[in-house]
């Protein structure tokens, strides 16, 4: 999906009002020095592409993020504020339902959500010129 035509300000508002708090709740109890962000993004469409991938694509050691509160709110925000996004996700959602697993918060998931926090922060401030 091409995120170029999303309403970025509306997504930013959804992030600040709800998604950010759910991410903090998920990460509560972890040390602020525990994880090192290795994923970055350079502009808002790029940030949303990375956020979508990390939130909804199962990875080795962390298959369960899509059912978390922050993920459901992310999905809702993208569906509302990105034209045509929900249509592109129908097949992906059906495939995900087939492989749904019990929610387990692993260290790998915590690391992944730490990466997501960094991506969302960069989405929130997409104002930087590369030196």
């Amino acid at each position: 999906y091409d995120f170029t035509n999303c309403d970025f300000e509306k997504i930013k508002a959804a992030y600040l009002s709800t998604i950010s708090k759910d991410l903090i709740t998920y990460m509560s109890g972890t040390k602020s020095t525990e994880f090192n962000n290795t994923v970055s993004c350079s502009n808002r469409p790029h940030c949303l592409t990375e956020i979508q991938s990390l939130t909804f694509n199962p990875t080795a050691g962390c298959a369960s993020l899509a059912k978390e509160m922050f993920a459901m709110k992310t999905k809702a925000a993208l569906a509302i504020w990105c034209p045509g996004y929900s249509e592109t996700q129908i097949n992906a959602t059906q495939a995900m339902k087939k492989r749904r697993k019990r929610k387990v918060t692993t260290n790998k998931c915590l690391e992944q959500v730490s990466q997501l926090q960094g991506l969302w922060r960069r989405f929130n401030r997409p104002l930087l010129k590369q030196q």
Epitope: E9, A13, Y15, L16, S17, S20, I24, S32, T33, E34, F35, N36, N37, S40, S42, S114, Q117, G118, W120, R121, R122, N124, R125, L127, L128, K129, Q130, Q131
Partner: antibody
Framework: EVQLVQSGAEVKKPGASVKVSCKAS????????IDWVRQAPGQGLEWIGV????????NFNEKFKGRVTMTRDTSTSTAYMELSSLRSEDTAVYFC????????????WGQGTLVTVSS | DIQMTQSPSSLSASVGDRVTISCRAS??????LNWYQQKPGKAPKLLIY???TLHSGVPSRFSGSGSGTDYTLTISSLQPEDIATYFC?????????FGQGTKLEIK
Amino acid sequence: EVQLVQSGAEVKKPGASVKVSCKASGYTFTNYFIDWVRQAPGQGLEWIGVIDAFSGGSNFNEKFKGRVTMTRDTSTSTAYMELSSLRSEDTAVYFCARESEVGEGFAYWGQGTLVTVSS
Amino acid sequence: DIQMTQSPSSLSASVGDRVTISCRASQDISNYLNWYQQKPGKAPKLLIYYTSTLHSGVPSRFSGSGSGTDYTLTISSLQPEDIATYFCQQGNTLPYTFGQGTKLEIK
């Protein structure tokens, strides 16, 4: 505990440059942006600019165009702000500040570095 | 640049009083409004971000509200340790800009 420790006070002559450092600890340095803000004696706050500690990307207040350079050293978790062509009105306390967890607002501040510009 | 205007510039109140400080932006800042507290010789402290979200560790007697161009910081019951200068800051548009400050004193 998040801490930002800045370099000591500086006295500079007009036309000179100053480089202020900001050493971060208590969090993963490259995960956050660092902003620079100054405060002239008895005055309000003025935003200078911001650097992404991960990429080194930066942006700054156009007021300081051509005079400010922001850099960082990830090996020492230190951010730097250099201001050149100093004039008397640059006399101020210079603060570094880290963004909040959500990227909105300046949540953690250094203790400030007094830069005095005087002939 | 967006101009931020605070009122009043100074304020005297008694312990236990409800105190409100106003901040007006020269254009709509879409709720990207933060509040800071600064005590003499110290760095500012973030109190509230995005108009009304309390930063971690900030007492619940502090609250924020507003929209568009007009925003308010409220202290529901003034405590002696709240004596400080308060600044608003807009985070909507670069360059970020601050209000001139409101100095709060005890009667």
